[in-house]
């Protein structure tokens, strides 16, 4: 079965520059299939733009300005590239690659899509570091004791653009865990988002990872934020203790680590 | 030119209650085309659901049913038992791949229908409220409540900033919420929640500790760390009266 990966979740360009969007085809030989590119502008229908067939023939949708889009494919890397020249804000859109995939039964085909790349056009260059800055929150003791479960929260701040993907995994496991997240929120000229994962007590002694994909991650690789295991011992509980606590009665353990 | 027009821009559905999406074709007979349905979820992933000739995407056959109403010139997609996973934008699209005549292998899309999923009506459930802290950051975690209407207040005299709460459907079909804020006096911040004409405080859920060593990160070396902007700290900590642990990276 054909599978399409678009490694860039977003691509930010300033006006008049050239954008190159990649699509990696697996499970099928790129030289034996056609690759299609679609565009979804905000508030508009998804529209076919251009395709490159197995024999290298390029077909463009009528009404698309000539010279704006270029499509090619590199069999060695099984990649198709959509090049958008002289970008303007009209080009802001999510771009999808797609291909027809034959089903087991003869004559049955479906069109599968890549995950899309959002093209973001800015008037001005970005600041030097607009990658997501993480802060972690570990489960409150109250939750682990009362509910035999614990919630990890991964806060990401001061990133640009707003396109971000977050998922959670246990250490030494590739299984994606069921998590929940808030909307991406604008704070001044950057964005913030948080995601949380609730795990049963038996998993609290395992290390968990909050994995973040963002265009401006250092070296272009996913950022992994490590949540250390939690050791839960026997505890005396008084859930209804509403007396005001002295500020010194609680020690907040905060580990700070900075890296270049 | 043909146009595919969804019946509704937004369709609210309840968990487990069947829902129907309709998409009409303007300018042509729907029988001259193959109809496809796709779902776009958060993060823009476009997943194939259904194509005429009884073709379903992986995992969709049991819970979805595609149909064509030739007389009304429209396509129908039924979600038989919606779950929170079915939230997203649903698109109808057509093509003529494999039909004689003018050969077109491109898809023509209609505008999306946003499907929002709500929990099924159920008895009211009081939330559990917990506070998590890290430096100036405070998170109020509100778990397993119904109905959705809720007011979350982080109580502090020294607020820096607060964010709108995130309210989502919990795996059990109720609601969970998180509200974040930044405060100069984060140690003294508490959370109070107004729900169903009652107030629930995070302090109702706090615990007294006899242990001096019950929350501790494993002592690990800073090696083989793939993260670019965070490193796993080597932690040797003496904890007294710890009721939460946090790590700033």
């Amino acid at each position: 079965a054909g599978h399409l990966e678009q490694p860039q979740i977003s691509s930010t360009k300033t006006l008049s520059k050239t954008a190159r969007l990649e699509c990696v085809v697996s499970g099928i030989t790129i030289s034996a299939t056609s690759v299609y590119w679609y565009r979804e502008r905000p508030g508009e229908v998804i529209q076919f733009l251009v395709s490159i067939s197995y024999d290298g023939t390029v077909r463009k949708e009528s009404g698309i300005p000539s010279g704006k889009f270029e499509v090619d494919r590199i069999p060695e890397t099984s990649t198709s590239t959509l090049t958008i020249h002289n970008v303007e804000k009209q080009d802001i859109a999510t771009y999808y690659c797609a291909l027809w995939e034959a089903q087991q039964e003869l004559g049955k085909k479906i069109k599968v899509f890549g995950p899309g790349t959002k093209l973001i056009i800015t008037d001005k260059q970005l600041d030097a570091d607009v990658s997501p800055k993480p802060t972690i929150f570990l489960p409150s003791i109250a939750e682990t004791k009362l509910q035999k479960a614990g919630t990890y929260l991964c806060l990401l701040e001061k990133f640009f653009p707003d396109v971000i993907k977050i998922h959670w995994q246990e250490k030494k496991s590739n299984t994606i865990l069921g998590s929940q997240e808030g909307n991406t929120m604008k704070t001044n000229d950057t964005y913030m988002k948080f995601s949380w994962l609730t795990v049963p007590e038996k998993s609290l002694d395992k290390e968990h990872r909050c994995i973040v994909r963002h265009e401006n991650n250092k070296n272009g690789v996913d950022q992994e934020i490590i949540f250390p295991p939690i050791k839960t011992d026997v505890i005396t509980m008084d859930p209804k203790d509403n007396c005001s606590k002295d500020a010194n009665d609680t020690l907040l353990l905060q580990l700070t680590n900075t890296s270049a | 030119a043909i146009e595919l027009v969804p019946e509704h821009q937004t369709v609210p559905v309840s968990i487990g209650v069947p829902a129907t999406l309709r998409c009409s074709m303007k300018g042509e007979a729907i029988g001259n085309y193959y109809i496809n349905w796709y779902r776009k979820t958060q993060g823009n992933t476009m997943t194939f659901i259904y194509r005429e000739k009884d073709i379903y995407g992986p995992g969709f056959k049991d819970n979805f049913q595609g149909d064509i109403d030739i007389a009304k010139n429209l396509a129908v997609l039924k979600i038989l038992a919606p779950s929170e996973r079915d939230e997203g934008s649903y698109y109808c699209a057509c093509d003529t791949l494999g039909m004689g005549g003018e050969y077109t292998d491109k898809l023509i899309f209609g505008k999306g229908t946003r499907v929002t999923v709500e929990p099924r009506s159920q008895p009211h459930t009081k939330p559990s409220v917990f506070v998590m802290k890290n430096g100036t950051n405070v998170a109020c975690l509100v778990k397993e409540f119904y109905p959705k209407d809720i007011r979350i207040n982080l109580v502090s005299s020294k607020k820096i900033t607060e964010f709108d709460p995130a309210i989502v459907i919990s795996p059990s079909g109720k609601y969970n919420a998180v509200k974040l804020g930044k405060y100069e006096d984060s140690n003294s911040v508490t959370c109070s929640v107004q729900h169903d004409n009652k107030t629930v405080h995070s302090t109702d859920f706090e615990v007294k500790t006899d242990s001096t060593d019950h929350v501790k990160p494993k002592e690990t070396e800073n090696t083989k760390q793939p993260s670019k902007s965070c490193h796993k700290p080597k932690a040797i900590v003496h904890t007294e009266k710890v009721n939460m642990m946090s790590l700033t990276v």
Epitope: S16, K89, Q90, D123, K124 | -
Partner: antibody, heavy 124, light 107 residues
Framework: QVQLQQSGPGLVKPSQTLSLTCAIS??????????WNWIRQSPSRGLEWLGR?????????DYPISVKSRISINPDTSKNQFSLQLNSVTPEDTAVYYC??????????????WGQGTMVTVSS | DIQMTQSPSFLSASVGDRVTITCRAS??????LAWYQQKPGKAPKLLIY???TLQSGVPSRFSGSGSGTEFTLTISSLQPEDFATYYC?????????FGQGTKLEIK
Amino acid sequence: QVQLQQSGPGLVKPSQTLSLTCAISGDSVSSNSAAWNWIRQSPSRGLEWLGRTYYRSKWYNDYPISVKSRISINPDTSKNQFSLQLNSVTPEDTAVYYCARESGSYYTDGFDIWGQGTMVTVSS
Amino acid sequence: DIQMTQSPSFLSASVGDRVTITCRASQGISSYLAWYQQKPGKAPKLLIYAASTLQSGVPSRFSGSGSGTEFTLTISSLQPEDFATYYCQEFNSYPYTFGQGTKLEIK
């Protein structure tokens, strides 16, 4: 509030260099949420954007192709001002020249603060 | 470059009138458009950005609409201080072209 004060000669000879300065008060030329522009206006050409300078971890400039080869816009952080230099002027460059602020870190919403304008005549 | 064409070039109206000025772009510019007001001897003043967002401090009688290639600036009830020249400007692509202007005069 933010104000822009322009200064510079009103008469320039053909083939020489037009130089104007725009002093900023109430904001910083090094702000990472603004850009500093020059715009001119003449009866024959109407309003015409000439370019900008701005700081985002380092200094950047943008110029339209029509003047790119002979224009330079430079910040002066010590005086909190920015300047325009237009080389090899001709009578076609006769216009009212404005400096203007464009707010927004990465996107442009328009020119929200303008200088008072300087009438520059190119004539021998 | 994108051409921005305003119509009419001249417009006579009376205090209290509702007036509409149109701006057409030679190609689609989505909503990347601003409107300015300019009085004789003065610098232009930003009224509206992103096609329809009112700049802070601008009276609510001014409104903007449109997207793609056709845009309008509407003044719901003309005041004496509104007689001026109005310009549109696109921010879709360099070089951020302005319209030629619409001069609004007292009838």
